[in-house]
Amino acid sequence: QTSVSPSKVILPRGGSVLVTCSTSCDQPKLLGIETPLPKKELLLPGNNRKVYELSNVQEDSQPMCYSNCPDGQSTAKTFLTVYWTPERVELAPLPSWQPVGKNLTLRCQVEGGAPRANLTVVLLRGEKELKREPAVGEPAEVTTTVLVRRDHHGANFSCRTELDLRPQGLELFENTSAPYQLQTFVLPATPPQLVSPRVLEVDTQGTVVCSLDGLFPVSEAQVHLALGDQRLNPTVTYGNDSFSAKASVSVTAEDEGTQRLTCAVILGNQSQETLQTVTIYSFPAPNVILTKPEVSEGTEVTVKCEAHPRAKVTLNGVPAQPLGPRAQLLLKATPEDNGRSFSCSATLEVAGQLIHKNQTRELRVLYGPRLDERDCPGNWTWPENSQQTPMCQAWGNPLPELKCLKDGTFPLPIGESVTVTRDLEGTYLCRARSTQGEVTRKVTVNVLSPRYE
């Protein structure tokens, strides 16, 4: 009778085991073990027992002890079960961002591991078990579907294998996959709201505001604002589930024409975009040209107004004839024209909007000097000792210098309050002098003596 010890062994893959073959007879002709495994007979005194070390056990095996005794040959098998944890435990790759409300399929693949009867695959969210199944097939695959919720944001999903050898007196061997961190998001179907000027003048600044509500998590939203190829650098302010991105936009002559203003919001693996066209225009103020800005009285003056080729101008309220970018008028300069404003108003239509620009020039007319009766009366009669202010206004451009002298030396204090005395009486020669010439006028002052009763 041949016996073997142990009759059943569970050992790690690549491990070794000592197997004792025994026979019930004292002097067996033969005692040995039959196995494809590498083996060594170890030291064991006596004839009816032999110990073998079987090494590098890679798979389940059934070595057989045999003995040949006088009463015949017999055999006994030992059952070697190899255990090993899986070589690969992996969650199938998924995009890290998942929209709320989507069904997410988690797929775990397990390669290797034995004995399969003791191997279980567990899908987890954090520490919560979502699914538990025995490992079947090579590779074993376990799947489960999760409806993505907002509160799943940041949750770790993983796959764990459990090789439970506790019934065999060993331990529970666990292998866990690399975790998959879920990032959930909500990006509304409505495009972002974009507020910006429809038209923008070259070398000016405009403000663009892009906003959107109903985002989650709003802090993860990326906002891209661009005008044509120019990336704008917005200042973003966040609300609970909204944001507002504000940016200044500067345009130059190179940008002239119709440009696309885009606001793109990227969250997770989705984006929403709003497009708007902004017309960049160049519209300098119209040019008011005077033949000469300063002319002498009686000179013929031409006033021209020139604007953008597509503009329509009015000069001093009078539209150009024909309606267009140029207008002009002719006049003979009079003193009344001095300081007269010539205003040109130009109107340009840009993307359906009317843009107005004005330019004003003033005409200076040189005239005079003038001394007339109205402003410089020729005769004054004042009571003696009364308070009087002699008035004499000389006109002209430039304003003339005025001096009134009696006998060439005694001045009449023009514009000053004086007490009328006998000395004031007499004829004064008032002389108004400017670069334009000189005029004189005689002014007589009469002083009335009081009557003594």
């Epitope: 000592l18 083996k39 060594k40 007979e41 170890l42 030291l43 064991l44 005194p45 006596g46 004839n47 110990v51 070390e53």
Partner: antibody
């Protein structure tokens, strides 16, 4: 440290008796099989005897069977070799040596310094 | 009964590789151990279970065992390696068996 120290060797006449001792220290004596190995002058090593860890099993080389007795006192951490009917060919240095914890592999990892037994008239 | 046969002597130049053989019937089916013994000293285990090195034994000592022959190899032999080397195995009777020993001379 782990140590084995032999004693009791000396000159003895043929047919005489001698008891060798081997004092063990630095390890759990009662867990190991212990051996006696001898070496005749100018010759090689020869296994003499082995005793199991609890003393219940003893093994001898054919050359000493019936004349030598191996024993141990685990309470004293001591191994003995009682040698009777000594012959001139028993003249040798006697070493005690510890067999590794798993005696199945049969190698000796710790040796004493040896004690000389001379059998001569 | 197993008998282990070793060459009585092996010579090697310093730095060269020394190989000491130990032969016996179906020796590869059992484990072989090797001991180094210097004059006047007790043996020291240098290789056990065919090819394993105890702690403290230099890496230049290695062993192999297959078929009927076990071999102790000393690569880059040094003067201090000069000693007697014994192989050892086991059988049911006698229980433990030593080879006759090989004297290694470092030239």
């Amino acid at each position: 440290q782990v140590q084995l120290v032999e004693s009791g060797g000396g000159l003895v006449q043929p047919g005489g008796s001698l008891r060798l001792s081997c004092a063990a220290s630095g390890f759990t004596f009662n867990s190991y099989y212990i051996n006696w190995v001898r070496q005749a002058p100018g010759k090689g090593l020869e296994w003499v005897s082995t005793i199991s860890s609890d003393g219940s099993n003893t093994f001898y080389a054919d050359s000493v069977k019936g004349r030598f007795t191996i024993s141990r006192d685990n309470s004293k951490n001591t191994l003995y070799l009682q040698m009777n009917s000594l012959r001139a060919e028993d003249t040798a240095v006697y070493y005690c040596a510890r067999t590794t914890l798993n005696y199945y592999y049969g190698y000796m990892d710790v040796w004493g310094q040896g004690t000389l037994v001379t059998v001569s008239s | 009964d197993i008998e282990l046969t070793q060459p009585p002597s092996v010579s090697v130049a310093p730095g060269q590789t020394a190989r000491i053989s130990c032969s016996g019937d179906s020796l590869g089916s059992k484990y072989v151990h090797w001991y180094q013994q210097k004059p006047g000293q007790a043996p020291v285990l240098v290789i056990y279970s065919d090819k394993k090195r105890p702690s403290g034994i230099p890496e230049r000592f290695s062993g192999s065992n297959s078929g009927n022959t076990a071999t102790l190899t000393i690569s880059g032999t040094q003067a201090e390696d000069e000693a007697d080397y014994y192989c050892q195995s086991y059988d049911s009777n006698p229980m433990l068996v030593f080879g006759g020993g090989t004297k290694l001379t470092v030239l």
